[in-house]
């Protein structure tokens, strides 16, 4: 067992050119808080993953201001170390995320608003009970400065912790294969703590809280005898040949504990033993509970209420995230219909719609034609979120009020004259050609490309076009 | 101008199920979470469960067995149904909105008077 | 889950004169996550205070909210005649979501 500490000595601007505008204004106070989380392993993991080693929160740092027309300082920090203990052997290499957190203090709506202002992660090996070491990390145009190390909570004591030592009790020496702590020589190595109820007399461990069988011995807690001697596989398949009686696979084969967790069999199943910081069944919650206020921007915590369960944020309309730490662009949804224009006002989304549409989302079709009248007889069609008059002949323009020329289109063919005329046109067909609009040619031998003509209509009589 | 209108029988029989319905007008449905709160004559306001209109639904554990909130987006409504009623689900229930700054109240109903009796 | 006790039960004051209203939470509220809201006899509550300390809008500046943590104060600093009603407070730190039992503000 232990604590990894972290002190951050400094968050302001990194060298070099394109210095940031100070997160801080005289309109909007701020202060800075941060967040570390720490990963076993050289893991590459995402941001969201667990931090199966521990996350701490730091206090919030004092309230800013910003001088106007300086530069953005170094921030003012918050007082104190971020602390992660952990309950277990301390892996030697570990990843980390630090994230700086602004709390902005202005008149907002709902309370203070948080957003994430910058996130380093980085990967390191570090031995407990080493000094301290120093680290600088940039993000985007800010830096971090800042120191980490791990040490050991007594009694534990080593590069991974898991060393246990105690007060000598003789003045001279340590017990039988006992060995002097350094650098602690005034205690002694304590012998290693196997796991509860491990067989003192067919058992052993060689680290804290296993349990490894002597031969002939089997189950986790080395009390199950083996029929024969010559069962030296502990776990293997029961042999015909040899007659040996071994348990199958046993619930805590593969450790199904999460986050360094160790399992014990019970009588239906089996139990783990959790790491402090983490809960549930298989350790796999981590131990943030709704106490911490883990949820930002107006977000509820919900669950969470004791450690043993996990927390979920419900986060307001307009953020997202794990812990509602993030704005939605939530124009990018396309939620406006019928090619109505987004605006993503903060507290509300509004659509602004098209002619012809209407809704919180421009979702309903207006009628168009409703209070329009085509002039003289046309009929109104809808389309498109705008209305169109289908006019009666001899008329035209957007509601049939003008009177048309119907023959300004030049509608009969092959040189035939046109006339109006009060119900439509008459195409007067130049000679060889018939048809409403002269289109058809009349054939030398009397025959047109036509049915036989209506009696008392002769080729090249005018045709009307009705 | 958003308001809110409940609607719904007033008298329950004890072990029925009670079922109101929430209009919603001046507001999307689809841009707030919408609430259910009660009110028993005389007493104090007892938060009864929250939906999202992506289904996203959160109830009081003292009520969480018994009660279902709906969402429909088309009717701009939602709706609350509480089974196996009992003299003391007896209250005025109301329909709130959910602020987009937190989980409190900015608009209600005028609220609807439940009794349940046989 | 936050129990929040309200104090004191009754408040009997003249117009004109100061109310101080009490909400002590079982456990901290984080971010000031606290609302109250003023109810009349036969209509729905209504919100006056959001984030501990901001208004509503519409809601006179008579009207002012304080606090933190675990204890917090909503402060009418002249009684109006249509001030005297049942005051709730309300978190919305983490779920359950919970009310205070009132305090009614009733004319002497």
């Known amino acids: 067992a232990g604590v990894f500490e972290l002190q951050i000595h400094s968050f302001g601007p990194g060298p070099g050119p394109g210095a940031p505008r100070s997160p801080c204004s005289a309109r909007l106070p701020c202060r800075l808080f941060f967040r570390v989380c720490l990963k076993p392993g050289l893991s590459e993991e995402a941001a969201e993953s667990p931090c199966a080693l521990g996350a701490a929160l730091s206090a919030r740092g004092p309230v800013y201001t910003e001088q106007p027309g300086a530069p953005a300082p170094d921030l003012p920090l918050p007082d104190g170390l971020l602390q992660v203990p952990f309950r277990d052997a301390w892996p030697g290499t570990f990843s980390f995320i630090i994230e700086t957190w602004r709390e902005e203090l202005g008149d907002q709506i709902g309370g203070p608003a948080w957003s994430l202002l910058a996130r380093v992660a980085g990967r390191r090996r570090l031995a407990a009970g080493g000094p301290w070491a120093r680290d600088i990390q940039r993000a985007g145009a800010w830096e971090l400065r800042f120191s980490y190390r791990a040490r050991c909570e007594p009694p534990a004591v080593g590069t991974a912790c898991t060393r246990l030592c105690r007060p000598r009790s003789a003045p001279s020496r340590c017990g039988p294969g006992l060995r002097p702590c350094a650098p602690l020589e005034d205690e002694c190595e304590a012998p290693l703590v196997c796991r509860a109820g491990c067989s003192p007399e067919h058992g052993f461990c060689e680290q804290p809280g296993e349990c490894r069988c002597l031969e002939g011995w089997t189950g986790p807690l080395c009390t199950v005898p083996v029929s024969t001697s010559s069962c030296l596989s502990p776990r293997g398949p029961s042999s015909a040949t040899t007659g040996c009686l071994v348990p199958g696979p046993g619930p805590c084969d593969g450790n199904p504990c999460a986050n360094g967790g160790s399992c014990s069999e019970t009588p239906r199943s089996f139990e783990c033993t959790c790491p402090r910081g983490f809960y549930g069944l298989r350790c796999e919650v981590s131990g943030v509970t709704c106490a911490d206020g883990p949820c930002f921007n107006g977000g509820l915590c919900v669950g969470g209420a004791d450690p043993d369960s996990a927390y979920i944020c419900h986060c307001p309309p307009g953020f997202q995230g794990s812990n509602c730490e993030k704005r939605v662009d939530r124009c990018s949804l396309q939620p406006c219909r019928n090619g109505g224009l987004c605006l993503d006002l903060g507290h509300a989304l509004r659509c602004r719609c098209r002619a012809g549409f209407a809704g919180p989302r421009c979702e309903h079709d207006l009628d168009d034609c409703a209070g329009r009248a085509c002039a003289n007889g046309g009929t109104c069609v809808e389309g498109g979120g705008a209305h169109r008059c289908s006019c009666a002949l001899g008329f035209g323009g957007r509601d049939c009020r003008e009177r048309a020329d119907p023959c300004a289109a030049r509608p009969c063919a092959h040189g035939g004259r046109c006339y109006a005329h009060f119900s439509g046109l008459v195409c007067a067909c130049a000679p060889g050609y018939m048809g409403a609009r002269c289109e058809f040619p009349v054939h030398p031998d009397g025959a047109s490309a036509l049915p036989a003509a209506p009696p008392g209509l002769r080729p090249g009589d005018p045709q009307r076009y009705l | 101008q958003v308001q809110l209108q409940e609607s719904g029988p007033g008298l329950v029989k004890p072990s029925e199920t009670l079922s109101l319905t929430c209009t919603v007008s001046g507001a999307s449905i689809s841009s707030f979470y919408w609430s259910w709160i009660r009110q028993p004559p005389g007493k104090g306001l007892e938060w009864i469960g929250y939906?999202?209109?992506?289904?996203?639904?959160n109830y009081n554990p003292s009520l969480k067995s018994r009660v279902t909130i709906s969402v429909d987006t088309s009717k701009n409504q939602f709706s609350l149904k509480l089974s196996s009623v009992t003299a003391a689900d007896t209250a005025v229930y109301y329909c709130?909105?959910?602020?987009?700054?937190?989980?409190?109240?900015?608009?209600w109903g005028q609220g609807t008077l439940v009794t349940v009796s046989s | 889950e936050i129990v929040l006790t309200q104090s004191p039960g009754t408040l009997s004051l003249s117009p004109g004169e100061r109310a101080t209203l009490s909400c002590r939470a079982s456990?901290?509220?984080?971010?000031?996550?606290l609302a109250w809201y003023q109810q009349k006899p036969g209509q729905a509550p209504r919100l006056l205070i959001y984030?501990?300390?901001s208004r509503a809008t519409g809601i006179p500046d008579r009207f002012s909210g304080s606090g933190s943590g675990t204890d917090f104060t909503l402060t009418i600093s002249r009684l109006e005649p249509e001030d005297f009603a049942v005051y709730y407070c309300q978190q919305y730190d983490r779920s359950p979501l919970t009310f205070g039992g009132g305090t009614k503000v009733e004319i002497k």
């Open positions: 709130a909105r959910i602020a987009v700054a937190g989980f409190f109240f900015d608009y």
């Open positions: 939906i999202y209109y992506s289904g996203t639904t």
């Open positions: 984030g501990a300390s």
């Open positions: 456990q901290s509220v984080n971010k000031n996550y």
